[in-house]
Structures are given as structure tokens and as C-alpha cells.
């Protein structure tokens, strides 16, 4: 005998919520794997900066995306399948995963706040490497997609550390149409925008983290309520 009434509502709410979560994880994982395994990227695992290979922040970022996508898919599946199957075991595992993820988020938040300057530096290096790859290997569509995302999200273009060639390519091809790059290349410096994001606009990252935390707590409560409802319905 299945759950009834309010518990049934929670069951479907949890299912829909986690199905969306699972889909989002799939998209992130798909994009990350495309970025990682596209032939035009794999032959540039180590880009040359001057005469020495650059430490590949670009790929570290992609591996983080792969991990995030995989975890999202796994947790989404547990919640989704656990809810629809009314499985106490799966829902219990789902709850445990959420508790671990919540703890990880809190730890990452504290670590991120303490190391925000280093993270900003790594993000800038990630941008520079993607930009370099997009210019050096003009077929690297994945790197172009990363650069485009940076430019459109941060409403910026280029940085004050560009080479002459990158400056020329950016001016002619890779800047958002509304960007000020044509009149003044460094007016919307992406390095500056990244620094601003990690200092002046740190509250935006904080708000995003709080929203994620609230959703996690909400899901934990729902999964526990549903688990108890399943237990009670199986008693009668």
C-alpha cells in the first residue's frame, strides 16, 4: 500500500525536484565531458606560455565540473528513484548524501572565503588559458564557448595582460557586441571584473550558497517526512 494525502504530495514534489536536479547534473556533466574530450582540446593539454608549459587551470576547472555533474546526477537519481519507488533505503542514502554535501558546502564556503584571492587568481588563469587556446587553436570551439561565457556573464572583454595577437583577435571576433572594447580595449577588463566578483560582489556568491543550502535543508526535511510516511503506511 502506497503513501496517501499530504505524503503523496511530498513524494511527487521530491520526484520532480530531483528529476530537475538530475537533468541539471546531466547537462553540467555533458558540457564538462565535451570540454574535456573534444579533439581540439586534448592535443592542447599543456599550452605553451612563453617557452614553458602552463599549469593547466583550464583542466582543473573542467574536472571540478565533471565531479559536480556526476554527484548531481547520482544524488538526483537517489532522490528521484527513491521517492517514486517509496524506498526507505534509497531515501535514507539520499538523506545521508545531502548531509555530506551540506557539510562539504559549509566547508567549501569557509575555505573559499579564506582563500578568495587565490581562487580569483585561479579563475583569471582559467580565463587566460581558455582565451589563449581559443586564439592559438582557432578551431577550439570549446575554449571559445568558455571565453564567450566569461565575456557575456561578466560583461567584459580581454585583460590588460593580453598579447598583441590576442588583442587583435578579440577586437575583431570575440567581444560582446555591447562591449566597450572598440573604443577602449581595457575598459571592461575581465581580470578586473573577476576581482570585483570576489571582493565587491562576494555577497552574490554568498546569496547563491545560502539558496543552495536552504534547498538542501528543504530536501532533507522532505526526504525524512516521506521516509516516515512510508514507514507508517507499511505498518498499517
Amino acid at each position: 500500500m502506497g503513501v496517501e494525502g499530504c505524503t503523496k504530495c511530498i513524494k511527487y514534489l521530491l520526484f520532480v525536484f530531483n528529476f530537475v536536479f538530475w537533468l541539471a547534473g546531466g547537462v553540467i556533466l555533458g558540457v564538462a565531458l565535451w570540454l574535456r574530450h573534444d579533439p581540439q582540446t586534448t592535443n592542447l593539454l599543456y599550452l605553451e606560455l612563453g617557452d614553458k608549459p602552463a599549469p593547466n587551470t583550464f583542466y582543473v576547472g573542467i574536472y571540478i565540473l565533471i565531479a559536480v555533474g556526476a554527484v548531481m546526477m547520482f544524488v538526483g537519481f537517489l532522490g528521484c528513484y527513491g521517492a517514486i519507488q517509496e524506498s526507505q533505503c534509497l531515501l535514507g542514502t539520499f538523506f545521508t548524501c545531502l548531509v555530506i554535501l551540506f557539510a562539504c558546502e559549509v566547508a567549501a564556503g569557509i575555505w573559499g572565503f579564506v582563500n578568495k584571492d587565490q581562487i580569483a587568481k585561479d579563475v583569471k588563469q582559467f580565463y587566460d588559458q581558455a582565451l589563449q587556446q581559443a586564439v592559438v587553436d582557432d578551431d577550439a570551439n570549446n575554449a571559445k564557448a568558455v571565453v564567450k561565457t566569461f565575456h557575456e556573464t561578466l560583461d567584459c572583454c580581454g585583460s590588460s595582460t593580453l598579447t598583441a595577437l590576442t588583442t587583435s583577435v578579440l577586437k575583431n571576433n570575440a567581444c560582446p557586441s555591447g562591449s566597450n572594447i572598440i573604443s577602449n580595449l581595457f575598459k571592461e577588463d575581465c581580470h578586473q571584473k573577476i576581482d570585483d566578483l570576489f571582493s565587491g560582489k562576494l555577497y552574490l556568491i554568498g546569496i547563491a550558497a545560502i539558496v543552495v543550502a536552504v534547498i538542501m535543508i528543504f530536501e532533507m526535511i522532505l526526504s525524512m517526512v516521506l521516509c516516515c510516511g512510508i514507514r507508517n503506511s507499511s505498518v498499517y
Epitope: V135, V136, D138, S160, T163, A164, S168, K171, N172, N173
Partner: antibody, heavy 119, light 112 residues
Framework: EVQLLESGGGLVQPGGSLRLSCAAS????????MSWVRQAPGKGLEWVSY????????DYADSVKGRFTISRDNSKNTLYLQMNSLRAEDTAVYYC????????????WGQGTLVTVSS | QSVLTQPPSASGTPGQRVTISCTGS?????????THWYQRLPGTAPKLLIY???NRPSGVPDRFSGSKSGTSASLAISGLRSEDEADYYC???????????FGGGTKLTVLG
């Protein structure tokens, strides 16, 4: 050893067309940006155009924009410069040069080919 | 009229030290783009001599050195030799014009 050999220069009347070629050897042509630089008699060097490794990106000096077209054939290791609507001021020695991303400059040059625009 | 200004000629005797200047503006040399120097010996292709203001490609003797200060750059040749007689060009990138710019060239004559 990197070698760049230009050809196709000569005498042409104003308004005429000419196609310059540059045969490259001694390096992976398909992985490098290439450029054309010219020098008019008694003048300094002037950058004309560049093309990216897979022809995605190109750019031109304002003085030649709309008249000159840069292209490449990676299977033949050859760079081209199609020059249309030629003017007397286009008279120059045209050099083909490899652009180095890491050094951010023209690291290898050809001997040049002379283009004379005169009636 | 070239964007980068070089003296049309320079001269020196063997063993002497000669300096060639290259003056630009805040949109090219002063903008932080490297200044590069090329040597063109009579009847040969231009050859990269100095890149990124002061770096020498392999094979270039250490008699050649480059430096940059503000909106100007300079090429110094110490222990001048007869085989150094050539045309020397400086080059940078101009962010306002969006083009690679060159100096008008300096003809170096080794006397005696």
C-alpha cells in the same frame, strides 16, 4: 630550418590584380599564424594582414581593407595574398612572415617579392 | 611617416658601442606590448634580433641587447663588427590603430 619563399610579384597596371604566394617549409605550417608585411621604396615596413592557423581569424591594415584577401592552403603549406584594385602606393616588396604566439612577433621572414604598380 | 620613430642612420667604428633609439607612444610601446627588433642585412630576409624588449632568440650574439623605458625602446650593439652593417627596425603593436607598427628603420654603417 624554417624557410619562406614568396613568388608572384611583378609589374601590374593600376586597377589590376595580382596573387602572391608563399611556400613554407621546415615547420608545422598548419599550426601557425601567418602574415604579410610590405616595404615601399624608401619607406619603413608596414604590416598588411594576418591569418590564423585554420583561417578562422583574419585582419587587414586599413590601407588594403576590401581590396586584399589573405588565404592559406594547409595541405600545400602555402600562404596567399590576392591583391585587387591595385594602386601606385601598393608598390613595395612584399614579405611573408610567420607569427610566433609565444614571442608575439614575426619570428621568420621570407626574402620578399617586388610588386610594381605603374602605367 | 612611421608610427615608431627611429634615426635614419647611425654609425660607429669596429669595437665601438652603438645605440639605436625607437620612440613610440602610450598606445604602443607604452601600452606594455613588447618591442621587437629586426636586422636586415643587404640582400637578405629580415631576421628577428630582439623580442619582448630585451630577449635574444638563440643564435643571436650577446653583443646585441634591448631595453625599454616608458614610451621608448633602444637597441645597443657593443663590440661593433663589419658584419653588423645592416638596416635595423623596431616593431610593436598599436592598440588605438589595431595594427602592428614598425619604425622607419635605421641604416647602420661600420666605419673604417
Amino acid at each position: 630550418e624554417v624557410q619562406l619563399l614568396e613568388s608572384g610579384g611583378g609589374l601590374v597596371q593600376p586597377g589590376g590584380s595580382l596573387r602572391l604566394s608563399c611556400a613554407a617549409s621546415g615547420f608545422t605550417f598548419s599550426s601557425n599564424y601567418m602574415s604579410w608585411v610590405r616595404q615601399a621604396p624608401g619607406k619603413g615596413l608596414e604590416w598588411v594582414s594576418y591569418i590564423s592557423s585554420s583561417s578562422t581569424y583574419t585582419d587587414y591594415a586599413d590601407s588594403v581593407k576590401g581590396r586584399f584577401t589573405i588565404s592559406r592552403d594547409n595541405s600545400k603549406n602555402t600562404l596567399y595574398l590576392q591583391m585587387n584594385s591595385l594602386r601606385a602606393e601598393d608598390t613595395a616588396v612584399y614579405y611573408c612572415a610567420r607569427y610566433s604566439y609565444s614571442r608575439d612577433n614575426f619570428d621568420y621572414w621570407g626574402q620578399g617579392t617586388l610588386v610594381t604598380v605603374s602605367s | 611617416q612611421s608610427v615608431l620613430t627611429q634615426p635614419p642612420s647611425a654609425s660607429g667604428t669596429p669595437g665601438q658601442r652603438v645605440t639605436i633609439s625607437c620612440t613610440g607612444s602610450t598606445s604602443n610601446i607604452g601600452a606594455g606590448y613588447g618591442t621587437h627588433w629586426y636586422q636586415r642585412l643587404p640582400g637578405t630576409a629580415p631576421k628577428l634580433l630582439i623580442y619582448g624588449n630585451s630577449n635574444r632568440p638563440s643564435g643571436v650574439p650577446d653583443r646585441f641587447s634591448g631595453s625599454k623605458s616608458g614610451t621608448s625602446a633602444s637597441l645597443a650593439i657593443s663590440g661593433l663588427r663589419s658584419e653588423d652593417e645592416a638596416d635595423y627596425y623596431c616593431q610593436s603593436y598599436d592598440t588605438n590603430l589595431s595594427v602592428w607598427v614598425f619604425g622607419g628603420g635605421t641604416k647602420l654603417t661600420v666605419l673604417g
